[in-house]
């Protein structure tokens, strides 16, 4: 790999998946490439085929086992290699030692549901998916609510600095359609980043009662 022209970025979902993106300027779209994962203290190794996601980048998921199995720990180091086919041979393009619990990106929260809705407030809960038991309560969340006439990017972020899988949205407008999203991040890890946003949950506040000031 030539200086500055390639990039190899991977994240661990804390259970049994390492997702990787490899980009290289000037690489041919139809080049066949793979990611190989070799843990330093495990008997298994794993490979995934890099598939194009844009003009000069490829991605793949290393499936290490059943979705909720704990395949790696905080002491593991995984050597990741990008290999591309050149004729009958495989050429190593990049080598990276990867500490999984320094590179966390969890799955998006799931099972969003409205617990209770009123005219001005709404209580919403969710669950985390495929998150390691190692975190115990060391997680944080961000949430956002889409109001009519606004974009997601304009929505203010609500931060929950603890493992709290519910929120009570206040000061909502009666009889109004909203959407809600949440994402999660462990507190540990040098390169740990936010999960993707959850699927949006649509809800509608109750209409104000006629003749009453609610």
């Amino acid at each position: 790999a030539v200086n500055g022209t390639s990039q190899f970025t991977c994240f661990y979902n804390s259970r049994a998946n390492i997702s990787c993106v490899w980009s290289q300027d000037g690489a041919l779209q139809d080049t066949s490439c793979q990611v190989h994962a070799w843990p330093d203290r495990r008997r298994w190794n794993q490979t995934c085929e890099l598939l194009p996601v844009s003009q000069a980048s490829w991605a793949c998921n290393l499936i290490l086992g059943a979705p909720d199995s704990q395949k790696l720990t905080t002491v593991d180091i995984v050597t990741l290699r990008v290999l591309c086919r050149e004729g009958v041979r495989w050429r190593v393009m990049a080598i990276q030692d990867f500490k999984p619990f320094e590179n966390l990106r969890l799955m998006a929260p799931i099972s969003l549901q409205v617990v209770h809705v009123e005219t001005h407030r709404c209580n919403i809960s969710w669950e985390i998916s495929q998150a390691s038991h190692y975190f115990e309560r060391h997680l944080e969340f961000e949430a956002r609510t889409l109001s009519p006439g606004h974009t997601w990017e304009e929505a203010p972020l609500l931060t929950l600095k603890q493992k709290q899988e519910w929120i009570c949205l206040e000061t909502l407008t009666p009889d109004t359609q909203y959407e809600f999203q949440v994402r999660v991040k462990p507190l540990q890890g040098e390169f740990t980043t936010w999960s993707p946003w959850s699927q949006p949950l649509a809800f509608r506040t109750k209409p104000a009662a006629l003749g009453k000031d609610t």
């Epitope: 790999a1 030539v2 200086n3 190899f8 990276q96 030692d97 990867f98 890890g189 040098e190």
Partner: nanobody, 127 residues
């Protein structure tokens, strides 16, 4: 800023192993990405490995063939380079380098990306 002193070089037989150390002093070691480079006689300095501030990612030159292992101990202000199955072509002066600018460990850095250098330690591999 930090000062760097390498140690651990020497004369080794082919097939042997060597552990190089680079001790940092005079600065906050954990705020620097660290790298190892080498320069063989009559050749340009070449990249060997680079590790991020916390050691969460370490990139290796493809030429290392999995024989090299770079790690850091921020509590001891030291970065290490372990070389296994040494070959005569590994003969070079090995340099430790520190980088003040942010490095995320996802690409191969150039030697010009590193601003602080040690004096080097000689590694000679005899066949």
């Amino acid at each position: 800023q930090v000062q760097l002193v390498e140690s651990g070089g020497g004369l080794v037989q082919a097939g042997g192993s060597l552990a190089l150390s680079c001790a940092a002093s005079g600065g906050t070691f954990s705020s620097y990405a660290m790298g190892w480079f080498r320069q063989a006689p009559g050749k340009e300095r070449e990249f060997v490995a680079a590790t991020t501030r916390g050691g969460g990612r370490t990139m290796y030159a493809v030429s290392t063939e999995g024989r090299f292992s770079c790690s850091r101990d921020n509590a001891k202000n030291t970065v290490y380079l372990l070389i296994k199955n040494l070959k005569p072509e590994d003969t070079a002066v090995y340099y430790c380098a520190a980088r003040t600018s942010y490095y995320d460990g996802t690409y191969y850095p150039a030697s010009s990306d590193f601003d602080i250098w040690g004096q080097g330690t000689q590694v000679t591999v005899s066949s």
